[in-house]
């Protein structure tokens, strides 16, 4: 998908109200400094690629972080404000459906986290560029 | 320390595809960062490729994006490059580096691939 | 796509001297410069990120600043060691990650 069109600033006011808070309460009683950021974005269609692929591709030691509440609000911010988003999302919401029921929080999946509030964080920088 | 390791053949006929595989020693590729490939024509300058990330995303340069495909076999620590349909022009040194997505911190020596019939 | 411009194209000086090579930018990239250095036969090694950033283990004699469309990389007193082609990357405008043409420090 090409987040080129998305309207960032609609998506930026998401984040800051909800999804960053909850990424926050997922990394409770983890430091700040525990992990370090191995990837980045550079502009805003580039950080919203790559905070889809983290949040919803499976990775070694973290199999599925799709059911997790910030989860949930990042593809619905990216359905509401990325036109098209929603339609191309249909095989990736069925592979969802089979993932673990259960929500287990491993080291690797904190950390997995810790890269995406840092992918968030440059997406929120106000010389971003837009495209 | 992270090594980088390119291997691959080094002649190549037109319209053939390249082939070249990094392989990764002193870091899992599965934990962290991401995977590139970088060129360089003999006497010129540096062209970006594309890269792979170490969960899956994948981005190509736009005026190779084509012909390229990127892969990773994370049980061997390894990275992939294939180029078809080459031609003279794709006649290079290929590094592969590991990026952050934005620049390159650790490159292998390079391999020089000619494309010649 | 953005353009980068490297100047000089090569700089003669001698060891103990300080060279200043310049990068333009065909239109404003931030401060997302990086700079490499390749000595012949060699892979590029990265010195400077985030235009003013060093890497890690680079000497401090490496400095770089700017922002927007024009950068500077100094090297305060060189050193044999310095002598080798400088390129600039940018990574302002993903997908399309571009080099400078490279400028050559040689000894004079």
């Known amino acids: 998908y090409d987040f080129t069109n998305c309207d960032f600033e609609k998506i930026k006011a998401a984040y800051l109200s909800t999804i960053s808070k909850d990424l926050i309460t997922y990394m409770s009683g983890t430091k700040s400094t525990e992990f370090n950021n191995t990837v980045s974005c550079s502009n805003r269609p580039h950080c919203l690629t790559e905070i889809q692929s983290l949040t919803f591709n499976p990775t070694a030691g973290c199999a599925s972080l799709a059911k997790e509440m910030f989860a949930m609000k990042t593809k619905a911010a990216l359905a509401i404000w990325c036109p098209g988003y929603s339609e191309t999302q249909i095989n990736a919401t069925q592979a969802m459906k089979k993932a673990r029921k259960s929500k287990v929080t491993t080291n690797k999946c904190l950390e997995q986290v810790s890269q995406l509030q840092g992918l968030w964080r440059r997406f929120n920088r106000p010389l971003l560029k837009q495209q | 320390q992270v090594q980088l390791q390119e291997s691959g053949p080094g002649l190549v006929k037109p319209s053939e595809t390249l082939s070249l595989t990094c392989t990764v020693s002193?870091?899992?590729?599965?934990?962290?960062?991401?995977w590139s490939w970088i060129r360089q024509p003999p006497g010129k300058g540096l062209e970006w490729i594309g890269y792979i990330s170490y969960y899956g995303s994948i981005s190509y340069n736009p005026s190779l994006k084509s012909r390229v495909t990127i892969s990773v076999d994370t049980s061997k620590n390894q990275f992939s490059l294939k180029l078809s349909s080459v031609t003279a022009a794709d006649t290079a040194v290929y590094y592969c580096?590991?990026?952050?997505?934005?620049?390159?911190?650790?490159w292998g020596q390079g391999t020089l691939v000619t494309v010649s019939s | 796509e953005i353009v980068l411009t490297q100047s000089p194209a090569t700089l003669s000086l001698s060891p103990g001297e300080r060279a200043t090579l310049s990068c333009r930018a065909s239109q404003s990239v931030s401060n997302n410069l990086a700079w490499y250095q390749q000595k012949p036969g060699q892979a590029p090694r990265l010195l400077i990120y985030?235009?003013?950033s060093r890497a890690t283990g680079i000497p401090a004699r490496f400095s770089g600043s700017g922002s927007g469309t024009d950068f500077t990389l100094t090297i305060s007193s060189l050193e044999p060691e310095d002598f080798a082609v400088y390129y600039c990357?940018?990574?302002?405008?993903?997908?399309?990650?571009?080099f400078g043409q490279g400028t050559k420090v040689e000894i004079k």
């Open positions: 985030d235009a003013s």
């Open positions: 580096a590991r990026t952050n997505l934005l620049y390159f911190d650790s």
């Open positions: 002193g870091y899992s590729i599965s934990s962290g960062y991401g």
């Open positions: 990357q940018q990574y302002s405008d993903w997908p399309q990650y571009t």
